[in-house]
């Protein structure tokens, strides 16, 4: 029995077939964050729930110390949503007084760390200015895309202000990845 | 011929190989909503187009009565975008008068219903305060993530206010799922 | 050895198995845009980086002249994020003067072009009114969904105002697709 009986003619014969259910996958959900030190010039990383409720890791995709650890090389779809919640600061007043300034903002970054490479790589960024009219505001930032990762790469989610992350529900703030 | 010739050494031998084109998949698109009764304490569910235009269901993934029916257990990527549009409510006036109140908001929830379980499970939520300066406003909320589902599970999309959903174009408001 | 030993009983026997690593995939990242002519009644298309940094195309998925070219028929997950940035226009003043008007807006459309079909098909649209209080504003629009595409189809990303696209970082504005 020849491999090409199972595959279109353009497939490389050495490309392994593999069962989909056996691929590394993870979906992590929010927990309440605590203040931590973080590297200068880098936003703080969120930590996550990895086994309770909707959260899971499987097929050698492990979560440890704020990182998802990539167990095998390949193309992964990576996604995250962070819901922010805050109170309006004085930014609108300052602007109404005619003095434009750097706007308040909320930012989410999905970052890849490769031990052999000195600098983390920012894979995805969602950033939004915030200058709301109302007293309380809340809003999500969603990110998702495909990246070629190497075995041993580590993924984390960084945010501009960890105290604004809505930790209250596992469906509001989450982070996941799966091998394609 | 041994199965492991087709798979990396870490594959469980019992994991079945299966053709990708045979996996359950659906992409549903918006239709004009009609007011309907809905459960107390639960947002109303949207109903969807499942076969015209860009919409389709395939490989035993069926749509019926606002639900996508999951035909086999496994890990699914589920997504939805809902575009909302509205007129500014009185919220900004109230706040300008110095009386902070709960902000108007728009919310999308992707919900799982399991017949053997009494309560629906909220898988994904996108929620945003809305207190716009302009008279007319419109904006999308996008959600997407991976979940382990069981055969017979049902998925629906609930929104906080069905009358604000933009039903005018199939590319603005949609709902989909596919087995990984 | 029979094919069904590798697949669940519901698999069509003629459905080919194929290695995941051999599927068409692309992730394109933003470059600085230059003003170009575009079709009347159609938003301008973005052009993209396809090989430097995080960007790649593989397995016969090619990028040429603003288009991703689909090399084989099947179901694809397609996604894009565009980050916009701008200065507040006069919209809020006009409204404060009591004359409601059409709001300023930002729009992203993922479009499919099929040579045998005269009109492009809009697959996904994200559109948002913009009437910010602050002087400078920035925000992303994210889109992603699954579509059945045919060999030879072409995909592009169109935006309402090319001059507002944040081209500064490859993680802020991107476009991708992969065969499921």
């Amino acid at each position: 029995l020849k491999g090409q009986e199972f595959a279109p003619s353009h497939q490389q014969v050495y490309a392994p077939l593999r069962a989909d259910g056996d691929k590394p996958r993870a979906h992590l959900t929010v927990v309440r964050q605590t203040p931590t030190q973080h590297f200068k010039n880098q936003f703080p990383a969120l930590h996550w729930e990895h086994e309770l409720g909707l959260a899971f890791t499987k097929n050698r995709m492990n979560y440890t110390n704020k990182f998802l650890l990539i167990p095998e090389s390949g193309d992964y779809f990576i996604y995250s949503q962070v819901t922010f919640r805050g109170m309006t600061s004085e930014c609108s007043e300052i602007r109404q007084a005619g003095r434009p300034n750097k706007p308040d903002s909320i930012t989410v970054v999905i970052t890849k760390v490769t031990d052999s490479y000195p600098e983390p790589t920012q894979l995805l960024m969602g950033t939004k200015s915030v200058c709301e009219v109302g007293s309380n505001w809340f809003q999500p930032i969603y990110l998702g895309a495909m990246f070629s990762l190497q075995e041993g790469d580590k993924l984390m989610v960084n945010v501009s202000d960890i105290s604004l992350v809505d930790y209250t529900k596992e469906d509001k703030t989450f982070f996941g990845a799966f091998l394609l | 011929l041994k199965g492991q010739e087709f798979a990396p050494s870490h594959q469980q031998v019992y994991a079945p190989l299966r053709a990708d084109g045979d996996k359950p998949r659906a992409h549903l698109t918006v239709v004009r909503q009609t007011p309907t009764q809905h459960f107390k304490n639960q947002f109303p569910a949207l109903h969807w187009e499942h076969e015209l235009g860009l919409a389709f269901t395939k490989n035993r993934m069926n749509y019926t009565n606002k639900f996508l029916l999951i035909p086999e257990s496994g890990d699914y990527f589920i997504y939805s975008q809902v575009t909302f549009r509205g007129m500014t409510s009185e919220c900004s006036e109230i706040r300008q008068a110095g009386r902070p109140n709960k902000p108007d908001s728009i919310t999308v929830v992707i919900t799982k219903v399991t017949d053997s379980y009494p309560e629906p499970t909220q898988l994904l939520m996108g929620t945003k305060s809305v207190c716009e300066v302009g008279s007319n406003w419109f904006q999308p909320i996008y959600l997407g993530a991976m979940f382990s589902l069981q055969e017979g599970d049902k998925l629906m999309v609930n929104v906080s206010d069905i009358s604000l959903v933009d039903y005018t174009k199939e590319d603005k408001t949609f709902f989909g799922a596919f087995l990984l | 050895l029979k094919g069904q030993e590798f697949a669940p009983s519901h698999q069509q026997v003629y459905a080919p198995l194929r290695a995941d690593g051999d599927k068409p995939r692309a992730h394109l990242t933003v470059v600085r845009q230059t003003p170009t002519q575009h079709f009347k009644n159609q938003f301008p298309a973005l052009h993209w980086e396809h090989e430097l940094g995080l960007a790649f195309t593989k397995n016969r998925m090619n990028y040429t002249n603003k288009f991703l070219l689909i090399p084989e028929s099947g179901d694809y997950f397609i996604y894009s994020q565009v980050t916009f940035r701008g200065m507040t226009s006069e919209c809020s003043e006009i409204r404060q003067a009591g004359r409601p008007n059409k709001p300023d807006s930002i729009t992203v459309v993922i479009t499919k072009v099929t040579d045998s079909y005269p009109e492009p098909t809009q697959l996904l649209m994200g559109t948002k009114s913009v009437c910010e209080v602050g002087s400078n504003w920035f925000q992303p629009i994210y889109l992603g969904a699954m579509f059945s595409l045919q060999e030879g189809d072409k995909l592009m990303v169109n935006v309402s105002d090319i001059s507002l696209v944040d081209y500064t970082k490859e993680d802020k504005t991107f476009f991708g697709a992969f065969l499921l």
């Epitope: 605590t34 203040p35 030190q37 919640r85 109170m87 309380n136 202000d161 960890i162 105290s163 604004l164 | - | -």
Partner: antibody, heavy 116, light 107 residues
């Protein structure tokens, strides 16, 4: 380990200004909010204001005209300044760090007496 | 501003008792209700956040419940070290506001 420590003048004359510094360790001010709360015998615990990681501030509207909160991220210090003090501003002043809805960690407080 | 009312200003209980302290908000605060413990030396600690979630390091004998406007803190098995004043605080709307406190004493 997360720690916050307030340092203030102790005694302030009526109509004068109060300045208190909160020095934090174990976390970065650039990405976490710090609240100010005071406790006086007559009023119990009273929230004064907050400075968020991104630098934005919110104040208790009853005190907004007299209050200013600022910070120096590089020195891990947050500053509270209150003008026109009167005797009913005598209290223990606390700084605390927290999420958007709660104060997770508190300093030990610094006592301020307004008296001539 | 939202008013937070703790009707019981002081409470006497015996070691080992189950003690419940209540707090009422003047309007719905969407479960954004926190409980703090203040020891006699002035030290303040967060015990419970978002109505019922235990802050890290807090013993499991503490629990919280409630919704809408009515909330409570329960100590299931009173210990000597629990002698303190307990404050509720709403975190739903600015300005954040506190209850007047319930002082817990040993009988």
């Amino acid at each position: 380990q997360i720690q916050l420590k307030e340092s203030g003048p102790g005694l302030v004359a009526p109509s004068q200004s109060l300045s208190i510094t909160c020095t934090v360790s174990g976390f970065s001010l650039s990405s976490y909010g710090v609240d100010w709360v005071r406790q006086s015998p007559g009023k119990g615990l009273e929230w004064l204001g907050v400075i968020w990681g991104f630098g934005g501030t919110n104040y208790n509207s009853a005190l907004k005209s007299r209050l200013s909160i600022s910070k120096d991220n590089s020195k891990s210090q947050v500053f509270l300044k209150m003008n026109s003090l009167q005797s009913d501003d005598s209290a223990i002043y606390y700084c605390a760090s927290g999420n958007f809805d709660a104060m997770d960690y508190w300093g030990q407080g610094t006592s301020v007496t307004v008296s001539s | 501003d939202i008013q937070m009312t703790q009707t019981t200003s002081s409470l006497s209980a015996s070691l080992g008792d189950r003690v419940t302290i209540s707090c009422r908000a003047s309007q719905d605060i969407s479960n954004y209700l926190n409980w703090y413990q203040q020891k006699p030396d002035g030290t303040v600690k967060l015990l419970i956040y978002y109505t019922s979630r235990l802050h890290s390091g807090v013993p499991s004998r503490f629990s919280g419940s409630g919704s809408g406007t009515d909330y409570s803190l329960t100590i299931s098995n009173l210990e000597q070290e629990d002698i303190a004043t307990y404050f509720c605080q709403q975190g739903n709307t600015l300005p954040f506001t506190f209850g007047s406190g319930t002082k817990l004493e040993i009988k």
